[in-house]
């Protein structure tokens, strides 16, 4: 016999909730293998800046980003799967992830804010090897990607520490409209932007930590009302 | 060992068109920008034009817009300049170089070929 | 007129030293993006000499090194030899007018 009344209306929404969970991880690690074994990509590894090889952020960034959609993914079908299925075995296992989930995040977070220094000069790396590629590897598609998201997020346009060639490239192509590189010399600098975003703008990451947080507790509170629904209601 | 070799420069009349073509060797021609640069009778150098290694991004000096288009054939490995609506002051040797990423600056050119503009 | 301005002629007698500067401004070599150097020897096809400022690419002899201050730059050649009597190119690139600029030439003669 199944759940009934509020509890099933709790399966529901669960199951909903993970759902979307599940297809946003998909997407996240979806995007990550293609930036990782994409061809055009891959030359990164081999890149050289002058004479020295390039440093391996880019791949660090896509790696954190598989790791996360394969979480993302496994949790999501765990409270999916064991929603639908009224499993407490499955949502007890998804219970005890989202409780180290939550353990993760917060200790994240902690890290994070000790470490945003450092955080911030590894997403500016990240930035620079990504529009790098864009510009030695004109047909890289995923580096372009890369760095107009950074562009449209940001609301910026390369940096003061540009090369000639990708000052040019940047002003015909790769300027989000609106933006003028060349005026008043990079007042739209992206490294700016990503240290204003790690220092000015820290409580906007905050919120967004905040926001998952409570998502969270709010899915171990589901999961733990559904379990005990489906406990009572096999008792009957 | 590197080589760019210019041809296609000669004399035409102001108002005229001309092709110029750089082939190249001894480089991975297909993974390089290629640049042209021009230097008018004993004057000094100037750039012209720059293309990226697949072609999907190309530049001009102002002098030069709409009048010229730079374009590659990678299969060939060689470089083109199409010049049209030509002016006494195109005039020149025109230089076509490679262009370095890392160094970024003009690394190889050639011997180049010269255009003269004259009626 | 040139973006960069040179000296238009250089000279020295063999074994001196000759130093050719490079002025620009805040939008080209002042803004940070390097300077580098050509050597075009009479009738043939300018070769880099000096690039990022400083570097030498390999086959260039140590007797040939480049600086960078502000918004000039130089080039420096000791131990003159008869065989460097050419013209000599400084090259950034212009963030106002978004195109590689050239020196106007400095032509060095070695003189005796």
């Known amino acids: 016999m199944g759940v009934e009344g509020c509890t099933k209306c709790i399966k529901y929404l669960l199951f909903v909730f993970n759902f979307v969970f599940w297809l946003a991880g998909g997407v996240i690690l979806g995007v990550a293998l293609w930036l990782r074994h994409d061809p055009q990509t891959t030359n990164l590894l081999y890149l050289e800046l002058g004479d020295k090889p390039a440093p391996n952020t880019f791949y660090v960034g896509i790696y954190i980003l598989i790791a996360v959609g394969a979480v993302m993914m496994f949790v999501g079908f765990l409270g999916c799967y064991g929603a639908i299925q009224e499993s407490q075995c499955l949502l007890g296992t998804f219970f005890t992830c989202l409780v180290i989930l939550f353990a993760c995040e917060v200790a994240a977070g902690i890290w994070g804010f000790v470490n945003k220094d450092q955080i911030a000069k590894d997403v500016k790396q990240f930035y620079d090897q990504a529009l790098q590629q864009a510009v030695v590897d004109d047909d890289a598609n995923n580096a372009k990607a890369v760095v107009k998201t950074f562009h449209e997020t940001l609301d910026c346009c390369g940096s003061s520490t540009l090369t000639a060639l990708t000052t040019s490239v940047l002003k015909n192509n790769a300027c989000p409209s609106g933006s003028n590189i060349i005026s008043n010399l990079f007042k739209e600098d992206c490294h700016q932007k990503i240290d204003d975003l790690f220092s000015g703008k820290l409580y906007l990451i905050g919120i967004a930590a905040i926001v998952v947080a409570v998502i969270m507790i709010f899915e171990m509170i589901l999961s733990m009302v559904l379990c005990c629904g489906i406990r009572n209601s096999s008792v009957y | 060992e590197v080589q760019l070799l210019e041809s296609g420069g000669g004399l035409v009349q102001p108002g005229g068109s001309l092709r110029l073509s750089c082939a190249a060797s001894?480089?991975?021609?297909?993974?390089?920008?290629m640049s042209w640069v021009r230097q008018a009778p004993g004057k000094g150098l100037e750039w012209v034009s720059y293309i990226s290694s697949s072609s999907s991004y190309t530049d001009y000096a102002d002098t030069v817009k709409g009048r010229f288009t730079i374009s590659r054939d990678n299969s060939k490995n060689t470089l083109y300049l199409q010049m049209n609506s030509l002016r006494a002051e195109d005039t020149a040797v025109y230089y076509c170089a490679s262009y370095s990423y890392g160094r970024d600056s003009f690394d190889y050119w050639g011997q180049g070929t010269l255009v003269t503009v004259s009626s | 007129q040139s973006v960069l301005t040179q000296p238009p002629s250089a000279s020295g007698t063999p074994g001196q030293r000759v130093t050719i500067s490079c002025t620009g401004s805040?939008?080209?070599?002042?803004?940070?993006?390097?300077t580098h150097w050509y050597q075009q020897l009479p009738g043939t096809a300018p070769k880099l000499l000096i690039y990022g400022n400083s570097n030498r690419p390999s086959g260039v002899p140590d007797r040939f090194s480049g600086s960078k201050s502000g918004t000039s730059a130089s080039l420096a050649i000791s131990g003159l030899r008869t065989e460097d009597e050419a013209d000599y190119y400084c090259q950034s690139y212009d963030t106002n007018l978004s195109v590689w600029v050239f020196g106007g030439g400095t032509k060095l003669t070695v003189l005796g």
């Open positions: 805040t939008s080209n070599i002042g803004a940070g993006y390097d």
């Open positions: 001894g480089f991975t021609f297909s993974s390089n920008y």
